[in-house]
Interface confidence: low
């Protein structure tokens, strides 16, 4: 066991927050300011991410973990680890290359991000439109026309609006 240990890479003893300094006989040196190492045995420390410009700091960098960024008001995160910030639009709009544009008739967007999506087609479920759709809201489907014939009970509550799809945005 001792023999195995002696053959080990001496750098493997350096904990997170340090690096194995080849210039100092492989001593474990603390990461310099504005750098970090999140795992042990590192030969260098990584430079901390800086949340600049449209990014703002969500979590400060420490010697063992990188900073985390989110976006300033009016923007939202895109990409893994908030690698990009994309401009917010208003509800009822979508972001195009030419900026925020209103949803076309027959589509809606109830969020400040993402794309306009088509209104639910109530007739596919044999239902009728109870509340018309807008640029900001999907239609609300109600009972089928047959259910509303004279004498028929109409106490059934309308179906909830369709849950917006969670496609990547």
């Amino acid at each position: 066991f001792e023999r195995t240990r002696s053959l080990q890479d001496p750098c493997s003893n350096c904990p997170a927050g340090t690096f194995c300094d080849n210039n100092r006989n492989q001593i474990c040196s603390p990461c310099p300011p504005n750098s970090f190492s999140s795992a042990g045995g590192q030969r260098t420390c990584d430079i901390c991410r800086q949340c600049k410009g449209v990014f703002r700091t969500r979590k400060e960098c420490s010697s063992t973990s990188n900073a985390e960024c989110d976006c300033t008001p009016g923007f939202h995160c895109l990409g893994a680890g908030c690698s990009m910030c994309e401009q917010d639009c208003k509800q009822g709009q979508e972001l195009t290359k030419k900026g925020c544009k209103d949803c076309c008739f027959g589509t809606f967007n109830d969020q400040k991000r993402g794309i306009c999506r088509p209104w639910t087609n109530c007739s596919l479920d044999g239902k009728s439109v109870l509340v018309n759709g807008t640029k900001e809201r999907d239609v609300v489907c109600g009972p089928s026309p047959a259910d509303l014939s004279p004498g028929a009970s109409s106490v059934t509550p309308p179906a909830p609006a369709r849950e917006p799809g969670h496609s990547p945005q």
Epitope: T44, D46, I47, K52, G53, V54, G79, A80, S83
Partner: antibody, heavy 119, light 106 residues
Framework: EVQLVESGGGLVQPGGSLRLSCAAS??????????VGWIRQAPGKGLEWVSG????????YYADSVKGRFTISRDNSKNTLYLQLNSLRAEDTAVYYC??????????WGQGTLVTVSS | DIQLTQSPSSLSASVGDRVTITCRAS??????LNWYQQKPGKAPKLLIY???NLETGVPSRFSGSGSGTDFTLTISSLQPEDFATYYC????????FGQGTKVEIK
Amino acid sequence: EVQLVESGGGLVQPGGSLRLSCAASGFSLSTGGVAVGWIRQAPGKGLEWVSGISGDGGTTYYADSVKGRFTISRDNSKNTLYLQLNSLRAEDTAVYYCTREDYGPHAYWGQGTLVTVSS
Amino acid sequence: DIQLTQSPSSLSASVGDRVTITCRASQSITTYLNWYQQKPGKAPKLLIYDASNLETGVPSRFSGSGSGTDFTLTISSLQPEDFATYYCQQSYSYSTFGQGTKVEIK
């Protein structure tokens, strides 16, 4: 000393492909917090940012003019950055510079490699 | 995308002149504005970063100022080696460049 040396440029027909390389020395391409990428300059024109890749390699960025046609990648073992150029057009004719971006400013530039798209 | 507009597009000046180049952004970019010098057949060289910080090794006759949407590069006393094209670049959101300002000998 930080150095970036591009290669791979040349004459190619419209619709053709090329792969540009950028050999880095004096720093590691995989250093966190350092992005590297490509900027081009058409003959007699200004500078246009083309593409970038984050230090951790997890994020790639492209200008709208090249999205879907160009692919940026790197080989950490060779400390080399690549730009694969597909479906080339006459308007892609330019000197392509490899750059290192230190949180915004492009602090280091290669000497450039000329890509000419012509039939 | 953020657009940068440089003015003038070219200017003629003499050695010893004070030269001012402006760069206007289409939206606020706080101070994330950088300046480069490019000579024919050469790669651009970083002069000023984050609006007003002089890059190491750049002569002190170069200075930068501004914030928000309006920025200025000033050469206090033009030297023969300063005749070149100058570009501004924003690093607030991705990276875009101004169209350049060519400084020529009068």
